[in-house]
């Protein structure tokens, strides 16, 4: 496939990654399948300066990103690596709570109302953000 | 137990339509990304398409894109697969495939198959 | 749109044989594969997930290794029933791809 060299309609570029950000909300998984079938994944946060981005884009709202545990350690959906990657946790977080009566502890990674990171039941509807990098290979013919 | 049943198969001339079905029993049926998966006789296994649990999003693949439509119907537990102005290359054994609830972990759930055969 | 390869397309091995399929895809899909058993007039059945997770019921002489674009199936010791076409599927972006089969026989 060719090269993607623009955003689709609707979504934002930033240092040339694609961001798409709901305005409904989902559980974990299923906010990735959508991502998925738009060809992109939840959002992988690799610098403070992406994380100012998606923050100043989705506010204060809990927002799912593309890190969990539900395996065991800490995994980013693009095969980033977690534990040289940047990270930007709320104090004393994670905690795999298991203290919300929901069954399980908490396995994925969400945007709290300050930004900062928090684990969670990834059944919880939260928001989500889509991310796909302009410069890999595209389905879709570059829009000249 | 968890099971798909496919119908609606069957000879059709070319440029006709067809409705492919799927009825879903033993699972939460509106929990779960579903699929089109088809066979041509002889050949590997072509993806066809995918609609998400709540119906948000869905996709066709290339060979079959503006000639398919992919829906659900979570009431009635049942998966449908319209594809329009059939072509002798659209002949194939349609499977209806149930995704994992991350649709990454594949499909782990398959039915029979219902046979098309696009013929005049 | 991403392009999966197999190889070999088809081997003939012995019952006790250790067996190895490779499936290669045309750009970086994490390790979003997934790996089919399919026998002839059958539905597929998943046996591998996430490239490495063994699905639930299969038999742990099934085995899937690999990341980014080269990925591994193996068969420790093949057993009668494993006679069958093996099939690698991305699953990381749409349309999920399969790859074109590799048929196991009976040497």
């Known amino acids: 496939g060719s090269e993607r060299t623009c955003c689709p309609v609707n979504w934002v570029e930033h240092e040339r990654s694609c961001y798409w950000f709901s305005r409904s909300g989902k559980a974990w998984a299923d906010a990735d399948n959508y991502c998925r079938l738009e060809d992109a994944h939840l959002v992988v946060v690799t610098s403070w300066e992406e994380q100012k981005f998606v923050q100043h884009h989705i506010g204060p709202v809990n927002t799912w990103m593309g890190l969990h545990d539900q395996n065991g350690p800490w995994k980013w959906v693009d095969g980033t690596d977690y534990e040289t990657g940047f990270k930007n946790w709320r104090p004393e977080q994670p905690d795999d709570w298991y203290g919300h009566g929901l069954g399980g502890g908490e396995d994925c990674a969400h945007f709290t109302d300050d930004g900062r990171w928090n684990d969670d039941v990834c059944q919880r509807p939260y928001r989500w953000v889509c991310e796909t990098e302009l410069d890999k290979a595209s389905q879709e013919p570059p829009l000249l | 137990q968890v099971q798909l049943v496919e119908s609606g198969g069957g000879v059709v001339q070319p440029g006709r339509s067809l409705r492919l079905s799927c009825a879903a029993s033993?699972?939460?049926?509106?929990?779960?990304?579903m699929h089109w998966v088809r066979q041509a006789p002889g050949k590997g296994l072509e993806w066809v398409a995918v609609?998400?649990?709540?119906?948000?999003?869905?996709k066709c693949a290339d060979s079959v894109k503006g000639r398919c439509t992919i829906s659900r119907d979570n009431s009635k537990n049942t998966l449908y697969l319209q594809m329009n102005s059939l072509r002798a290359e659209d002949t194939a054994v349609y499977y209806c495939?149930?995704?994992?609830?991350?649709?990454?972990?594949?499909?782990?759930?398959w039915g029979q198959g219902t046979t098309v055969t696009v013929s005049s | 749109d991403i392009q999966m390869t197999q190889s070999p397309s088809s081997v003939s091995a012995s019952v006790g044989d250790r067996v190895t399929i490779t499936c290669r895809a045309s750009?970086?899909?994490?390790?979003?594969l997934a790996w089919y058993q399919q026998k002839p007039g059958k539905a597929p059945k998943l046996l591998i997930y996430?490239?490495?997770s063994l699905q639930s019921g299969v038999p742990s002489r099934f085995s899937g290794s690999g990341s980014g674009t080269d990925f591994t199936l193996t068969i420790s010791s093949l057993q009668p029933e494993d006679f069958a076409t093996y099939y690698c599927?991305?699953?990381?972006?749409?349309?999920?791809?399969f790859g074109p089969g590799t048929k196991v026989d009976i040497k």
């Open positions: 996430a490239a490495s």
């Open positions: 750009q970086g899909i994490s390790s979003w």
């Open positions: 033993g699972f939460t049926f509106s929990s779960f990304g």
């Open positions: 609609i998400l649990n709540d119906g948000s999003n869905k």
């Open positions: 495939a149930r995704g994992q609830q991350w649709l990454v972990n594949g499909v782990d759930v």
């Open positions: 599927q991305q699953t990381n972006s749409v349309p999920f791809t």
